[in-house]
């Protein structure tokens, strides 16, 4: 009696199942009690000797490529051996690599967690994922795993993390990079500083007083509000960041406390108050202001 090993499918793709069947074309296995055993190269597979002429392999990998055969043993201990069959496991190269961010859109608050998720639409086996920062890439991390996605985490984002990022996936057919993704770090405004600027050391009535408000940190655009004794004087915008100024033509009523507020949509901060007082210098005919 002759024995044949049949693999289905005969050219499996990595990660897919394969069924090995030990066939005896000229002998029904029911005619006699047979025990079956399957081998790869020199090693027995699965449970060893079994009454089933089939062996199910749940997932085949590149390293499972090899020479397979089976043996059948009768109750009388006669052993039949099949010819060897070469099974080549096909690896699918990585394709369509993409990089996504969590939170989506690549906008993240300073101090928050950022995750860079690298994915491949296709690819089998062990895939090495690498993450790079900057157009001329600085390698941040690499991970090798048997999955189509991998994550790189920045637990607490800093201002210096605002950059371009990309990832690369590779499974033996050459590296494949994703497109670039830009990370914008959103920074709440710091407490602004209010400065009063006058054309001379002691400003007089009808002089123009400049109120300059500036938050030293904070993502643009920044909106500044100017106050006199908690009454709104007006607002100014700084579309590219930096400070903003508000001009006042002075009268006697402008004595008192001034403050400003900075707001960039991520929180508002109020400056310390600056006091402006009128003084009447000896021999002077007009009132003067000092701060």
């Amino acid at each position: 009696a002759e024995l044949f090993l049949i693999a289905s499918p005969s050219h499996p793709t990595e990660g897919s199942p394969v069924t090995l069947t030990c066939k005896m074309p000229f002998l029904q296995s029911s005619d006699a009690q047979f025990q079956f055993c399957f081998f790869r190269d020199t090693r027995a597979l699965g449970p060893g000797w079994s009454s089933s002429p089939k062996l199910q392999i749940a997932a085949m990998w590149k390293e499972d490529t090899g020479s397979y055969w089976c043996e059948a043993q009768t109750m009388a201990s006669k052993v039949l051996r099949s010819r060897r069959s070469q099974i080549n496991v096909h690896r699918v190269p990585v394709a369509d690599v993409s990089l996504e961010t969590q939170p989506p859109g690549g906008q993240v608050m300073e101090g928050d967690r950022l995750v860079l998720i690298c994915s491949v639409a296709m690819g089998t086996g062990d895939i090495t994922f690498l993450w790079y920062k900057g157009a001329v890439g600085l390698n941040l991390q690499s991970k090798t795993q048997r999955s189509l996605t991998a994550e790189y985490e920045i637990p607490s984002v800093r201002e210096s993390d605002a950059e371009q990022y990309y990832c690369v996936a590779e499974n033996g057919y050459g590296p494949s990079p994703s497109g670039l993704v830009s990370i914008t770090v959103r920074i709440p405004v710091s407490r602004p500083i209010l400065m009063l600027r006058a054309p001379r050391a002691q400003a007089a009535v009808e002089d123009v007083l400049e109120l300059h408000c500036e938050a030293l940190r904070g993502s643009p655009p920044i909106l500044y509000w100017f106050y006199h004794e908690d009454i709104t004087l007006g607002s100014r915008s700084a579309p590219s960041g930096g400070g903003a100024s508000f001009n006042l033509s002075l009268t006697e009523e402008h004595s008192g406390n001034y403050s400003c507020e900075a707001n960039n949509g991520l929180g508002a901060q109020r400056s310390e108050a600056v006091t402006l007082n009128f003084t009447v210098p000896t021999g002077a005919r007009s009132n003067h202001l000092t701060s």
Epitope: G106, Y132, A135, V136, V168
Partner: antibody
């Protein structure tokens, strides 16, 4: 297939500005940096700067800072290079080029735009 | 700025013969990430530049294997093992390691 198609030749007077466009097709515009390189007549190549269209963030060669503005319009997949305060030595062919990260090279170039500065 | 100096500036060649172009940088162009971003481009008459070699010695896809790149640190070489008529044009080395990125002044290759 990937293509970078630039706007036509320009003649400008000294002191004027010029804006050259570079329309990209055949790939995801926001995935790669676009660079600008110029070449004066009979001269070599000079790198001017780049933009990442994904966030519109440009980087410039200090030599041109204050005179060059590189922008990108993702709705039309077009990059622009504007050069102001033109002088006769700005007469050159201006190229846009796509740069592939990781491998790091300019793989596709526009056909070039001749800008002539003459009074 | 890093100055890229090519030599010779003009190279008359005989088809079938080898050719070599040298490119020297004024300082090391090894990037802080360990890579050396040295590329070679060929500009044929009336055309845009086209890539030949990247990262010192990697041949771009579709570039004939008669082109090879070598070197390290500050000294780099482009070799053509057997020049063909279609190889005429101006060859530029380029460094993309340190901003501002810079090109060599070019080497004009022409048939004798």
């Amino acid at each position: 297939q990937v293509q970078l198609v630039q706007s036509g030749a320009e003649v400008k007077k000294p002191g004027a500005s010029v804006k050259v466009s570079c329309k990209a097709s055949g790939y995801t515009f926001t995935s790669y940096n676009i660079h600008w390189v110029r070449q004066a007549p009979g001269q070599g190549l000079e790198w001017m700067g780049w933009i990442y269209p994904g966030d519109g963030n440009p980087k410039y060669n200090e030599k041109f800072k204050g005179r060059v503005t590189i922008t990108a319009d993702t709705s039309t997949s077009t990059a622009y290079m504007e050069l102001s305060s033109l002088r006769s030595e700005d007469t050159a062919v201006y190229y846009c080029a796509r740069r592939i990260h990781y491998y790091d090279y300019f793989d596709y170039w526009g056909q070039g735009t001749l800008v002539t500065v003459s009074s | 700025d890093i100055v890229m100096t090519q030599s010779p500036l003009s190279l008359p060649v005989t088809p079938g013969e080898p050719a070599s172009i040298s490119c020297r940088s004024s300082q090391s162009i090894v990037h802080s990430n360990g890579n050396t971003y040295l590329e070679w481009y060929l500009q044929k008459p009336g055309q845009s530049p086209q890539l030949l070699i990247y990262k010192v010695s990697n041949r771009f896809s579709g570039v004939p294997d008669r082109f090879s790149g070598s070197g390290s640190g500050t000294d780099f070489t482009l070799k053509i093992s057997r020049v063909e008529a279609e190889d005429v044009g101006v060859y530029y080395c380029f460094q993309g390691s340190h901003v501002p990125w810079t090109f060599g002044q070019g080497t004009k290759v022409e048939i004798k």
